[in-house]
Amino acid sequence: FERTRSLQDPCSNCPAGTFCDNNRNQICSPCPPNSFSSAGGQRTCDICRQCKGVFRTRKECSSTSNAECDCTPGFHCLGAGCSMCEQDCKQGQELTKKGCKDCCFGTFNDQKRGICRPWTNCSLDGKSVLVNGTKERDVVCGPSPADLSPGASSVTPPAPAREPGHSPQ
């Protein structure tokens, strides 16, 4: 162990991965297993997070950094640092207090998490529905009905044809 000699705070010499032991004349003692200190000059070590149950270990704890957890398959992380795991649902569903429920007509969810959201209202943008929505997909809005009047084309005009005898550049 390192005995520190700083004139100001002797603990400031204790590196990450150790704690400054007030009861032992400011000796820098290593953090015990399953604990860490991420900065120097600490008087305590933090107990490592344990990824148990529905949590699984994404990164092991070390003497200088905490463990990081994620969720087992079928669950996803919620909250800062994956503080909670929430059950996945299928696309086209949302999680309620009673479990996964299909999206109501007029709503969709294209992910395994989150809530069902209303289909886009194409008419608000003066457009028409090109592809109908489903429980899993939003509607696809197309050109406005006015753009589809006779003589108007929503299709990009073809590129001009090359002159015969000319090869591509």
Epitope: F19, P32, P33, S35, R43, I47
Partner: nanobody, 120 residues
Framework: EVQLVESGGGLVQPGGSLRLSCAAS????????VGWFRQAPGKEREYVGT??????HYGDFENNRFTISRDNAKNTVYLQMNNLRPEDTAVYYC???????????????QGQGTQVTVSS
Amino acid sequence: EVQLVESGGGLVQPGGSLRLSCAASGRTFDNYAVGWFRQAPGKEREYVGTYWSGYAHYGDFENNRFTISRDNAKNTVYLQMNNLRPEDTAVYYCAISLKYPMATVTPDYQGQGTQVTVSS
């Protein structure tokens, strides 16, 4: 709600021994360091020691007379006190924290304490 319950205190003669127990309900000790503190009448609370992951850290007064250990199966932490002196008379508290050691720490939870009296 976490509850810590200390037991094993009592009256003992100088030079005698006691083993205090700290049991947790509502949560296991798995994720926590467990500490012991004591408070004598009219005095400030004094740090006794902390146990975590097979390691124990002790206050500077106990001179190897006190030993902290843990029984995982019983979810109980013990404070073995040998060669007791009258100045060890105090209420002994068990506490848990996410910090090791707990010498400079306010615990997350603390029990109600158990009285230890050393007298002839």
